[in-house]
């Protein structure tokens, strides 16, 4: 950056080189150039000469004043007009930054995705700080009282192998930058209570043309957890409102769930599961589309990311890919 240049003087910022966004700031430039009594001192921001709010303090020093400075980053340098010099002489430069102290981190959540071997901790960091902000995740065993700290700039994955202090822990997050420091409240966890089962996936769907047409959704998970509760939500793609069905599930075999749906309508399905009675759910699975046939089956067009075809008495869709969707993700 501009801070690496050779200086013939000194540039400094008050109150500091990193300051709160919206503050009034002063940038001072002091020349120390051999055989030069500067006629004029100039300031440049991001290479553009500043023309206003410059005050000459004495023979070698000038001040540039900014009101309500709102730029997250700027490169400042100053120059001198020396007698007998054709060009301006560079005095010095400095990178300045403005931003905000961190908010109190909240919504601290730690989960163990089955088979991942990690505990993943996330939090809501609050408003954008604009400046380098680091987070320290504190994990303290309630059994041994031993505390471990993990430095990160966003979320953290902690190997479950490193959690040697039993099953119960306190977790909290400290956020710090040049403008302030905040800490979250403490989350108490039990490792057995935060496991999220291996992802549930909808593999295919078929509509059987019986007296009342019936759609069967086939779905599965590789989980080894015995007691799993799941929800499947579905709606016509033209609807806003989801219908939700709940299941107590044993994944020793592929699940088949039956739905009685309107004919000739494109539906979307998603599934999610949790260990029964525990706190955290999987995110909703990829969107799975299936178009129900007209009362007399006919070939239907390709559905988004799935193939739909005519198979005599059934119309089926199979999953051919994954489209992730978080648990707030509705489609219109």
């Amino acid at each position: 950056g501009i801070t690496n240049i050779n200086c013939s003087g000194h540039i400094w910022v008050e109150p500091a080189t990193i300051f709160k966004m919206g503050m009034n700031i002063s940038i001072y430039c002091q020349a120390a150039i051999k055989n030069c009594q500067p006629r004029k001192l100039h300031f440049y921001k991001n290479g553009i000469k500043e023309r206003f709010q410059i005050t000459r303090i004495n023979k070698t020093t000038a001040r540039l004043w900014y009101k309500n400075f709102l730029e997250p980053h700027a490169s400042m340098y100053c120059t001198a007009e020396c007698p007998k010099h054709f060009q301006e002489t560079l005095i010095c430069g400095k990178d300045i930054s403005s931003g905000y102290p961190p908010d109190i981190p909240d919504e601290v959540t730690c989960v163990i995705y089955e088979y991942s071997g990690n505990m993943t901790c996330t939090w809501n960091a609050g408003k954008l700080t604009y400046i380098d902000t680091k987070y320290v995740v504190h994990v303290k065993s309630l059994e041994t009282e031993e505390e471990q700290q993990y430095l990160t700039s966003s979320y953290i994955n902690i190997s479950t192998d490193s959690l040697q202090g039993g099953k119960k822990y306190l977790v909290w997050v400290q956020a710090a930058n040049a403008l302030g420091m905040e800490e979250s409240k403490q989350l108490q966890i039990h490792l057995d209570d935060i496991v999220i089962p291996s992802a549930a996936v909808i593999s295919r769907a078929e509509t059987i043309n019986a007296t009342v047409p019936k759609t069967i959704i086939y779905w599965d998970s590789q989980t080894t957890i015995e007691k799993v509760s799941c929800e499947m939500r579905y709606k016509a793609t033209t609807n806003q409102t989801w219908n939700v069905k709940e299941f107590d599930t044993n994944f020793t075999y592929v699940q088949q769930s039956e739905f009685y749906l309107e004919p000739n309508i494109k539906y979307v399905f998603q599934v999610r599961c949790q260990e029964t009675g525990k706190r955290y759910w999987q995110p909703w699975s990829s969107l799975f589309f299936h178009k129900t046939p007209e009362t007399v089956p006919q070939v239907t067009s390709k559905a988004f990311q799935h193939d739909t075809w005519n198979s005599g008495l059934t119309v089926a869709s199979i999953s051919t890919g994954h489209l992730t969707s978080d648990n707030r993700g509705d489609i219109g």
Partner: antibody, heavy 116, light 107 residues
Framework: QIQLVQSGAELVKPGASVKLSCTTS????????IHWMKQRPEQGLEWIGR????????IYASKFQGKATLTTDTSSNTAYMLLSSLTSGDTAVYYC?????????WGQGTTVTVSS | DIVMTQSPKSMSMSVGERVTLSCKAS??????VSWFQQKPEQSPKLLIY???NRYTGVPDRFTGSGSATDFTLTISSVQAEDLADYHC?????????FGGGTKLEIK
């Protein structure tokens, strides 16, 4: 701007009770813990206890169990400490502060004088 | 409860001198120690957290060090405005506890 503003000085009689307040601004009181400290003249700081304003959960130092009762009113972002059965040993400056491990913001303190 | 012991109780130093304040914990507290400065008739102000992290706006003449049971606050070149009481405290476990304080006087 983050501030903790405490109620004014109190002169109370032995055996009486007093309720101190700590009104916060610049943050949501439910996002942090409020702690209370005692400081007698020319002495160190003593931690009284902590409240989680989000749910009212409290932790007290054993010495202050039964002496201090911590509450909050989240609608007004205010924390309270009730001190009961006051004796001369309760004469002190009481501070509220906020945080989990590190106390970066403090109230200005409330002086409680117990005298007949 | 964890007992925090500060020494000395008071000290008198000249401007420009190096000052070292000690704080000892009765058991291992990791780095869960903070230092506070309290000027006459004022509330305590956080100087150092996590044993060695300087809080925002604290002059760099203040340095914290140590872990486990022995902690030090160093003022590299004491200034007249550093006249104050200095407290150490632990946040390793409940109840939170503090040392008795060190009174720093300026000659």
């Amino acid at each position: 701007q983050i501030q903790l503003v405490q109620s004014g000085a109190e002169l109370v009689k032995p055996g009486a009770s007093v309720k101190l307040s700590c009104t916060t601004s610049g943050f949501n009181i439910k996002d942090t813990y409020i702690h209370w400290m005692k400081q007698r003249p020319e002495q160190g700081l003593e931690w009284i206890g902590r409240i989680d304003p989000a749910n009212g959960n409290t932790i007290y130092a054993s010495k202050f169990q039964g002496k201090a009762t911590l509450t909050t009113d989240t609608s007004s972002n205010t924390a309270y400490m009730l001190l009961s059965s006051l004796t001369s040993g309760d004469t002190a400056v009481y501070y509220c502060t906020r945080g989990t491990s590190w106390f970066a913001y403090w109230g200005q303190g409330t002086t409680v004088t117990v005298s007949s | 409860d964890i007992v925090m012991t500060q020494s000395p109780k008071s000290m008198s130093m000249s401007v420009g001198e190096r000052v070292t304040l000690s704080c000892k914990a009765s058991e291992n507290v990791g780095t869960s120690v903070s230092w506070f400065q309290q000027k006459p008739e004022q509330s305590p102000k956080l100087l150092i957290y996590g044993a060695s992290n300087r809080y925002t706006g604290v002059p760099d003449r203040f340095t914290g060090s140590g872990s486990a049971t022995d902690f030090t606050l160093t003022i590299s070149s004491v200034q007249a405005e550093d006249l104050a009481d200095y407290h150490c405290g632990q946040s390793y476990s409940y109840p939170r506890t503090f040392g008795g304080g060190t009174k720093l006087e300026i000659k």
